[in-house]
Interface confidence: low
Amino acid sequence: LRLLDHRALVCSQPGLNCTVKNSTCLDDSWIHPRNLTPSSPKDLQIQLHFAHTQQGDLFPVAHIEWTLQTDASILYLEGAELSVLQLNTNERLCVKFQFLSMLQHHRKRWRFSFSHFVVDPGQEYEVTVHHLPKPIPDGDPNHQSKNFLVPDCEHARMKVTTPCMSSGSLWDPNITVETLDTQHLRVDFTLWNESTHYQILLTSFPHMENHSCFEHMHHIPAPRPEEFHQRSNVTLTLRNLKGCCRHQVQIQPFFSSCLNDCLRHSATVSCPEMPDTPEPIPDYMPLWEPRSGSSDYKDDDDKGSSHHHHHH
């Protein structure tokens, strides 16, 4: 979690002198409670916006907006603490709006916004706006919270952000998978414009089951520049297990910008009608970061084989 770097953070508006400060997420009104505290924010809205850094990088940001209630407690409102919590890591980042002048009632409801918290693709956040000073221990809460799910890199606008492009979001392998016979699977995909290697991860399943019955990993060496954007094909040899007929093919690139953490692409071939189902095998997990759905690869005795070609 971080703040977007480029422009001075502003919270002043007509009729209000305000400054944005870094916050430890522990306002001193917790430690030194006040008798009179303002009411909670109203109509907290979180939206996905996009902003450029000074370097020209494009990042997704959380646009936080809220209004004040039209009660007398605005006379005691000294500012606001904005907190963003990343749910999977418990990482929290806060900023503080410090009002340097007292708020007065006016015809239009007071409205505040902040768009400088950089968020990550596919992550969920809890956004909280606390009015300051915070209430005494037994006082009514004067904050409002909302969860905010950031779309992943498949989302059209997200795809062109710097973090997604760094993960290889612009590469569309256009995978096709074809069953040649009971023992062979042909995989075709489009190479990207980088001389980097790929791994094809084949996971086969019985009909209607999620425990795999065969797995195989095939390494594709880095293509030469003249092969960029060309179709590559690989023929994978399947293990001859009756009913082990639903095949998921996942292609993992190793682009220089994301190494072992690039976005993966998958394609699946369904079983023909009414197969038999063998004994399931427990799931395993790889060392690198899971991506794009199923990512459990293993083999109880890898007898799969494969060969591949780049097409010009």
Epitope: T89, E91, Q123, H216, D283, P286, L287, W288, E289, K298
Partner: antibody, heavy 118, light 107 residues
Framework: EVQLVESGGGLVQPGGSLRLSCAAS????????MNWVRQAPGKGLEWVSF????????YYADSVKGRFTISRDNAKNSLYLQMNSLRDEDTAVYYC???????????WGQGTTVTVSS | DIQMTQSPSSLSASVGDRVTITCRAS??????LAWYQQKPGKFPELLIY???TLQSGVPSRFSGSGSGTDFTLTISSLQPEDVATYYC?????????FGPGTKVDIK
């Protein structure tokens, strides 16, 4: 030069806490998963914890689950291990290690020593 | 969880000897196996990954083989600088368990 430097080890009483840090340099830290591995005096290597590049996947060894917390700050090129409720058997040299594309761990720190003793 | 065992636990051999260390997984792990060398007082160093791929900079006298459950590390001609403890490690899923180690020294 690709480098990992651990710090934060020391002597702590049973039940106490320590926070280990690992400072990475010479590579794009934010693109790599990371691990903590430990080695008790005169013993073998024991994998402790794993965190993926974007912190979306975290694993722990059963021996530390519920007591240790792995985290990272990609902006600071730093990996952390918060160790609570420490026991005598947690006494070890703790290494941070980077996984290699293709498998294994190809970059290791020099280790930091944690001693749990009353 | 999958258990990793190594044999022998220690061995002594003469300079120039061919040395073989085996590692066994209690369940199949395909080729998701690495070998490390750790010299006394030093951090471990990666020798082999993907069961048989030699890590850059590692002398060619080291080689790895195997797939599924049984794996072998071979030193074709033991050198004095090879005195160390050797560990295998599986990395197909967490926990990423190490074998107990094999201590190699010179007769």
């Amino acid at each position: 030069e690709v480098q990992l430097v651990e710090s934060g080890g020391g002597l702590v009483q049973p039940g106490g806490s320590l926070r280990l840090s690992c400072a990475a340099s010479g590579f794009t830290f934010s693109s790599y998963s990371m691990n903590w591995v430990r080695q008790a005096p005169g013993k073998g290597l024991e994998w402790v914890s794993f965190i993926s590049a974007r912190s979306s996947t975290i694993y722990y060894a059963d021996s530390v689950k519920g007591r240790f917390t792995i985290s990272r700050d990609n902006a600071k090129n730093s990996l952390y291990l918060q160790m609570n409720s420490l026991r005598d058997e947690d006494t070890a040299v703790y290494y941070c290690a980077r996984p290699k594309v293709g498998g294994g761990m190809d970059v290791w720190g020099q280790g930091t020593t944690v001693t749990v003793s009353s | 969880d999958i258990q990793m065992t190594q044999s022998p636990s220690s061995l002594s051999a003469s300079v120039g000897d061919r040395v073989t260390i085996t590692c066994r997984a209690s369940q199949g792990i395909s080729n998701y196996l690495a070998w490390y060398q750790q010299k006394p007082g030093k951090f471990p160093e990666l020798l082999i990954y993907a069961a048989s791929t030699l890590q850059s900079g590692v002398p060619s006298r080291f080689s790895g083989s195997g797939s599924g459950t049984d794996f072998t590390l071979t030193i074709s001609s033991l050198q004095p600088e090879d005195v160390a403890t050797y560990y295998c490690q599986k990395y197909n899923r967490a926990p990423f368990t190490f074998g107990p180690g094999t201590k190699v020294d010179i007769k």
